[in-house]
């Protein structure tokens, strides 16, 4: 490798390895090495090796080291944000009210104008306004997947309050997915969650949104608060460019 | 600031500035500023100013960007694990066998053996071997709390496998308060998400260490692989040495 | 990504992730850790190119901004961007200990 | 952590965070980022000694490693840890855009 | 301050024993081996053998099994060696010394005097 | 068991002097190495762990280095309060086992 001055690569595989035994014995806290004076003959133990081996290995559900930063995601996102269809829409009249759910919906085809293409979304959130909410509530979002079928998404404790304050749930993926199909209207579903045993399943949170009766000025705001997704995504040009450009150096 | 050579720290904060004219421009890849001659007069629009700021706003549940690592967690961590009380133990007895759930308790004596004090404990495991699994399993995960009350910690989408598969569930704050408290035995009960709706809640999925009729070698094996709490600890000694040692340079 | 998967299989002058593989025995004299007998450290190597001023053809910087100089440093260093923990065997005295370093294992570099 | 807390109430001579205020008219000449008017981008600067030879006083060593070269690199390098995004709003013609530029300000420095 | 104090000078008779004890402050008793050393005169330091005081756990050199025994009391932090049918060539200062892991002996005792002569 | 071989067995020096004594064990003791200051009526006292480590409170005038099976103890300049008998040990296997000593003396 040569910069104005040639890197001897040896010397500086000798400075690493000779730094790797000075943070190997400080990370271990160690001023020098444990002498092996007193370790017993023979294999290590087998819990230990059990305990290694499970230290080890990845296990599903259990999270990585953060990935590295995708090229992509280097350059600026633009941000969008689509509301939900309002709740006066007919889509709404085909899901029954419940105590325990309630149904948001969106626009695909503003969704669309917004990323034209799925590659491009680089995030997507869904924010809800919650109203005060007097008991802790568990509650799970669902995104609408067949004619009268839910696939459960995530799920958020939230905690009593005096105050509104916004909710935010990752559905990049579902959002990418719809981007690919032809639908018109997509949806999600705010539910309590229910326990196998427990039968008072009634959703306690108050969305702005979903409340009625209101009049004038009032509901305006109320409905600009209403859900939306805020979109991420690399403009459709920059994307075009980032194509073009994309090599090997 | 002084090395070897005086560092201009003015010329420093001008390099830095001029990259940071490149860096903004390179990020929206842009060539050169726009043009400002098309932008319509006054005050930016409402609509704008609201996206800016539910941008700009951080919300509950949104993940910021990754926390620096505290100092105590650049040293090592001391693995140990501690294994499930075994099924025949009385414990099992007062709770009911049901379709949608399976206990799992743990002896706190030799947690506290492992993790001498809460504030130690640097992450805690619940690891599940799970046997193979004909169809998509939704599971949840529940602390138990009080004498017949249980507390939801998280859920987790299992997808049909033919092989057995380890799962892990991060329970560090649920051992961290173990540690704190003086119950001799605590546990978690593995369920069936329950959809308000439906009414097939059975628990599919097959946990090494819960089913019956195995015997000799088979039966040890299987112990060996009974669900377990994997814990990652600062040893007392450590801690001590950090504590004393602890100052602003 | 410079990760392993692209610099190792390249002949990339600027700043890249490096091949290095640590065997405890041989190339640090210690005998005490148990398992693993060693394990690839690598370590990040190579010029970062301090690429923007008024006067630079802006044209040829922004293709480039991103590599050389992505968080608009004075003076952008090749370090470790995706790091992994290493789990280690050890004996203190008479006892086995098993521990779990953190950010040992470089994976992939940046310029920072 | 060597964060805007510790570095901005301190006289820290090595690898730290440095205060450094953009703002887009003044510093940069640009009347074309309506929000926001300018932002706390601040730098990482000053010494990461190399702290490790077998002849080293390995006392002093030890509290050191962690600030100094905690990731073990050859030549450390105070570079970023941890960095905010930044949304700006600027018009494209008669367009107004809100755009999220990730890491641009810098909340924390390291030694790597 | 880390300290072991010794216990005071002893003349002995050969075929007699010796005990000798050593009283640790300063630290926690039980979370470092204490060993036992011995220097006869004009000649070097030979080691004898040591104690966990955790576990109780105890390791004799070859030339002093049988003879030797280690003992602790972990109430006081004490630690003890005794020496049985002793001969004139034991004639020598016993030290008890700290272990510590890294492969070396931190913190001694002053060290007492076991002479013995008919 | 290992053996350590040190050397010289005693040395003439003044207040000053850069002084030097050697260690040599049977096998490779794999860097645990250690030496160690004994005066009349005194505790010992450890200097040096790990063949270079110095311990705490201990001034930088004392050194050490090697490897494998060769170790060596230097003082760059004598103080008067140096004079005394060094000793070696390998921690690496057991028995621990120390070198002879060397008695440094004033000339």
């Known amino acids: 490798l040569s910069t104005c001055k040639t890197i001897d690569m040896e010397l500086v595989k000798r400075k690493r390895i000779e730094a790797i035994r000075g943070q190997i014995l400080s990370k271990l806290r160690l001023a020098s090495p444990p002498s092996q004076g007193e370790v017993p003959p023979g294999p290590l133990p087998e819990a230990v090796l059990a305990l290694y081996n499970s230290t080890r290995d990845r296990v599903a559900g259990e999270s990585a080291e953060p990935e590295p930063e995708p090229e992509a995601d280097y350059y600026a996102k633009e941000v969008t944000r689509v509301l939900m269809v309002e709740t006066h829409n007919e889509i709404y009249d085909k899901f029954k009210q419940s105590t325990h759910s309630i149904y948001m919906f969106f626009n695909t085809s503003e969704l669309r104008e917004a990323v034209p293409e799925p590659v491009l979304l680089s995030r997507a959130e869904l924010r809800l306004l919650r109203l005060k909410l007097k008991v802790e509530q568990h509650v799970e979002l669902y995104q609408k997947y067949s004619n009268n079928s839910w696939r459960y998404l995530s799920n958020r404790l939230l905690a009593p309050s005096d105050s509104p304050e916004w909710l935010s749930f990752d559905v990049t993926g579902v959002v990418r997915q719809w981007l690919s199909r032809g639908g018109e209207i997509e949806g999600f579903r705010l539910s309590a969650h229910c326990s196998c045993d427990s039968r008072d399943n009634t959703l306690q949170v108050d969305i702005n949104g979903f409340t009625t009766g209101r009049r004038g000025d009032l509901a305006t705001i109320h409905g600009m608060n209403r859900p939306f997704l805020l979109l991420m995504a690399t403009p459709l040009e920059r994307a075009q460019h980032l194509q073009s450009s994309r090599h090997r150096r | 600031l002084s090395t070897c050579k005086t560092i201009d720290m003015e010329l420093v904060k001008r390099k830095r500035i001029e990259a940071i004219r490149g860096q903004i421009l390179s990020k929206l890849r842009l060539a050169s500023p726009p043009s400002q001659g098309e932008v319509p007069p006054g005050p930016l629009p409402e609509a704008v100013l609201a996206l800016y700021n539910s941008t700009r706003d951080r919300v509950a549940g949104e993940s910021a960007e990754p926390e620096p690592e505290p100092e105590a967690d650049y040293y090592a961590k001391e693995v140990t694990r501690v294994l499930m009380v075994e099924t025949h133990n009385e414990i099992y007895d007062k709770f009911k066998q049901s379709t949608h759930s399976i206990y799992m308790f743990f002896n706190t004596s030799e947690l506290r053996e492992a993790v001498p004090e809460p504030v130690l404990l640097s992450r805690a495991e619940l690891r599940l071997l799970r046997l193979k699994l004909k169809v998509e399993q939704h599971v949840e995960l529940y602390q138990k709390y009080s004498n017949n009350s249980w507390r939801y910690l998280s859920n987790r989408l299992l997808a049909p496998s033919d092989s057995p598969e380890w799962l892990s569930f991060d329970v560090t704050g649920v051992v961290r308060q173990w540690l704190s408290r003086g119950g001799e035995i605590e546990g978690f009960r593995l369920s069936a998400h329950c959809s308000c709706d439906s009414r097939d809640n059975t628990l599919q999925v097959d946990i090494n260490g819960f089913t019956t009729g195995r015997r000799g070698d088979l039966a040890t094996i299987h112990g060996m692989n009974r669900p377990f709490l994997l814990l990652m600890a600062t040893p007392l000694e450590r801690a001590q040495h950090l504590q004393s040692s602890r100052h602003r340079r | 990504a410079l990760d392993t998967n692209y610099c190792f299989s390249s002949t990339e002058k600027n700043c890249c992730v490096r091949q290095l593989y640590i065997d405890f025995r041989k190339d640090l004299g210690w005998k005490w850790i148990h398992e693993p007998k060693g394990y690839h450290a690598n370590f990040c190597l190579g010029p970062c190119p301090y690429i923007w001023s008024l006067d630079t053809q802006y044209s040829k910087v922004l293709a480039l901004y991103n590599q050389h100089n992505p968080g608009a440093s004075a003076a952008p260093c090749c370090v470790p961007q995706a790091l992994e923990p290493l789990p280690i065997v050890y004996y203190v005295g008479r006892k086995p200990k098993v521990e779990q370093l953190s950010n040992m294992i470089v994976r992939s570099c940046k310029c920072s | 952590a060597l964060d805007t807390n510790y570095c901005f109430s301190s006289t820290e001579k090595n690898c730290c965070v440095r205060q450094l205020y953009i703002d887009f008219r003044k510093d940069l000449g640009w009347k074309w980022i309506h929000e926001p008017k300018g932002y706390h981008a601040n730098f990482c600067l000053g010494p990461c000694p190399y702290i490790w030879s077998l002849d080293t006083q390995y006392s002093k060593v030890l509290a050191l490693y962690n600030q100094h070269n905690p990731g073990a690199s050859a030549a450390p390098c105070c570079v970023p840890q941890a960095l905010e995004p930044l949304p700006i709003v600027y018009y494209v013609g008669r367009k107004p855009k809100v755009e999220q530029l990730s890491n641009m300000i810098v909340r924390s420095c390291k030694c790597s | 301050e880390v300290q072991l104090v010794q216990s005071g000078a002893e003349v002995k008779k050969p075929g007699a024993s010796v005990k000798v004890s050593c009283k640790a402050s300063g630290y926690t008793f039980t979370s470092y081996d204490m060993h036992w050393v011995r220097q006869a005169p004009g000649q070097g330091l030979e080691w004898m053998g040591r104690i966990d005081p955790q576990s109780g756990g105890i390791k004799y050199a070859q030339k002093f099994q049988g003879r030797a025994t280690l003992t602790v009391d972990t109430s006081t932090s004490t630690a003890y060696m005794e020496l049985s049918r002793l001969r004139s060539d034991d004639t020598a200062v016993y030290y008890c010394a700290r272990w510590d892991y890294g492969g070396y002996f931190d913190v001694w005792g002053q060290g007492t005097l076991v002479t013995v002569s008919s | 068991d290992i053996q350590m071989t040190q050397s010289p067995s005693s040395l003439s020096a003044s207040v000053g002097d850069r002084v030097t004594i050697t260690c040599r064990a049977s096998q490779d003791i794999y860097n645990y190495l250690n030496w160690y200051q004994q005066k009349p009526g005194k505790a010992v006292k450890l200097l040096i762990y790990?063949?270079?480590r110095l311990e705490t409170g201990v001034p930088s005038r004392f050194s050490g280095s090697g490897s494998g099976t060769d170790y060596t103890l230097t003082i760059s300049s004598l103080q008067p309060e140096d004079f005394a008998t060094y000793f070696c040990?390998?921690?690496?296997?057991?028995?621990?086992?120390f070198g002879q000593g060397t008695k440094l003396e004033i000339k």
């Open positions: 790990y063949t270079s």
């Open positions: 040990q390998q921690g690496d296997t057991l028995p621990w086992t």
